[in-house]
């Protein structure tokens, strides 16, 4: 267990041309407050997928009303740390977003405004007891410039804060394969409870004798690193000896979702629909007011001015949720074309274009003509995305500039013999058979099938097929 | 600005029908995709029928056979017709598109949302 801490230097205009006006006037002063959502691994940064790992609410800053024709200067922050309590191991990498919002203090009909504005993500390691670490991020015109670090909750220690300290028994060492533990040298490290041979690197417990793994890592001593490449199934638990993840139970088994949540699975896990008044990752999370600013994505808190009354949140189109925190799935609509990808960016939608297909929609089939030449006469020939030329006769490869053999395919039939022509092929026919490709029977009687054999020409000799 | 106005919806019983529609107006070059998405308390947001940017017709697979889906491309607006309606289909439809602008930039808007309730 542990906490990580969030320290926000400053909010302001970035560098460069184009300063963002200020978000406060006369009019409407305003103040800025902050909300961290940090989710385990090299997740997506989706701001609407669980924040896993935990989320916090900064206080609102000071009131900030702007000075007519100034600048927008670094905006008045609110006091202290945000901190995201984590009850088990920290996980060495994880995702953050951090969203700055601001709160608009004019007259409004039922209360204050919030409105978003900017939201920054990122995907960083860290271990847990290290020094802070700086960031400075940048969401449109806006800087947002911050230091955060993971620390252990005692007795826990180490890098992911899964092994245990206790107060020495001895004034003078540890007990006999215990060591101190750094940095609090006046205590040392509790025995190992975990199951024997539980790797300390990728495994940790909070029982005697179980081993339970960090992400990316399975088996009865988390020593084998989840691969599902070659796995059928999306659920655990996993595998000992491949890591592959294997039909078990399913994660809503049990409804981990407290409070009369409602339990989903999601392809790596769970996600509970909380009831109003809940939040967090098992809507553990309560009494929560309207004051609380718990309405994300822009929704308008009603009601819940004390802790015992429900707030509802009034989400603007295409987000959805108790706390409007997740967003509509528009992808579904499948607006892009050609087989592109779409995906949904929260501000935007984008499509990830096929080979030969351009434009926001993917909606441009790209003239692979523009530019191509077909040699020796050849024509070029769109078609999905790619080129193909037509050639002339007698020549032929994918830009028509091979020669082509046109008796390689034995045009001649009934055994007729086929000679390469500047101009095409000729067919000396066998005895018994005319016709450019030898291809009609001579009657007996001297006529042929079809067609007449034009003046001057016998059966037989050689025919040039024009 | 782009403006989706449903309407349509209303109370049926098990079994019946109604007819929703969905008109685009406003700065519109022209329609990308366009559908209905529904809402049930409690629910997520889903997707039920729509045209796609390719121009196929797409169903959640709860509603084929039961609801149609159809378009007045000149009107900017499209229907759904639903039939054989269950107590599981109430929830409030909303109107979705994706909308290409005179700027020619693309946008994706929703309606307001029409209720639809199956009840005995």
């Known amino acids: 267990a542990g906490v990580f801490e969030l320290q926000i230097h400053s909010f302001g205009p970035g560098p460069g041309p184009g300063a963002p006006r200020s978000p406060c006037s006369a009019r409407l002063p305003c103040r800025l407050f902050f909300r961290v959502c940090l989710k385990p691994g090299l997740s997506e940064e989706a701001a609407e997928s669980p924040c896993a790992l935990g989320a916090a609410l900064s206080a609102r800053g000071p009131v900030y009303t702007e000075q007519p024709g100034a600048p927008a200067p670094d905006l008045p922050l609110p006091d202290g740390l945000l901190q995201v309590p984590f009850r088990d191991a920290w996980p060495g990498t994880f995702s953050f977003i951090i969203e700055t919002w601001r709160e608009e203090l004019g007259d409004q009909i039922g209360g204050p405004a919030w409105s978003l504005l900017a939201r920054v993500a990122g995907r960083r390691r860290l271990a847990a007891g290290g020094p802070w670490a700086r960031d400075i991020q940048r969401a449109g015109a806006w800087e947002l410039r911050f230091s955060y670090r993971a620390r252990c909750e005692p007795p826990a220690v180490g890098t992911a804060c899964t092994r245990l300290c206790r107060p020495r028994s001895a004034p003078s060492r540890c007990g006999p394969g215990l060591r101190p533990c750094a940095p609090l040298e006046d205590e040392c490290e509790a025995p190992l409870v975990c199951r024997a041979g539980c790797s300390p690197e990728h495994g940790f417990c909070e029982q005697p004798g179980e081993c339970r793994c960090l992400e990316g890592w399975t088996g009865p001593l988390c020593t084998v690193p989840v691969s599902t490449s070659s796995c059928l199934s999306p659920r655990g638990p996993s595998s000992a000896t491949t890591g592959c993840l294997v039909p078990g139970p399913g994660p809503c088994d049990g409804n981990p979702c407290a409070n009369g949540g409602s339990c989903s699975e999601t392809p790596r896990s769970f996600e509970c629909t909380c009831p109003r008044g809940f939040y967090g990752l098992r809507c553990e999370v309560s009494g929560v007011t309207c004051a609380d600013g718990p309405c994300f994505n822009g929704g308008l808190c009603v009601g819940g001015a004390d802790p015992d009354s429900a707030y509802i949140c009034h989400c603007p189109p295409g987000f959805q949720g108790s706390n409007c925190e997740k967003r509509v799935d528009r992808c579904s609509l499948q607006p892009c074309r050609n087989g592109g990808l779409c995906l949904d960016l929260g501000h935007a939608l984008r499509c990830r274009c096929r080979a030969g297909f351009a434009g926001p929609r993917c909606e441009h089939d790209l003239d692979d003509c523009a530019g191509r030449a077909c040699a020796n006469g050849g024509t070029c020939v769109e078609g999905g995305g790619a080129h193909r030329c037509s050639c002339a006769l007698g020549f032929g490869g994918r830009d028509c500039r091979e020669r082509a053999d046109p008796c390689a395919a034995r045009p001649c039939a009934h055994g007729g013999r086929c000679y390469a022509h500047f101009s095409g092929l000729v067919c000396a026919c066998a005895p018994g058979y005319m016709g450019a490709r030898c291809e009609f029977p001579v009657h007996p009687d001297g006529a042929s099938a079809l067609p007449a054999a034009p003046p001057g020409l016998r059966p037989g000799d050689p025919q040039r097929y024009l | 600005e782009v403006q989706l106005v449903e309407s349509g919806g209303g109370e049926v019983q098990p079994g019946g029908s109604l007819r929703l529609s969905c008109a685009a107006s406003g700065s519109i070059l022209s329609i990308n995709a366009m559908g209905w998405y529904r809402q049930a308390p409690g629910k997520q947001r889903e997707m039920v029928a729509g045209?796609?940017?390719?121009?196929?017709?797409i169903y959640a697979e709860s509603v084929k056979g039961r609801f149609t889906i159809s378009r007045d491309n000149a009107k900017n607006t499209v229907y759904l017709q639903m039939s054989s309606l269950r107590a599981e289909d109430t929830a409030v439809y909303y109107c979705a598109a994706d909308v290409q602008l005179f700027s020619r930039d693309y946008e994706f808007y929703w309606g307001q949302g029409t209720l639809v309730t199956v009840k005995p």
């Open positions: 045209f796609t940017g390719d121009g196929n017709t």
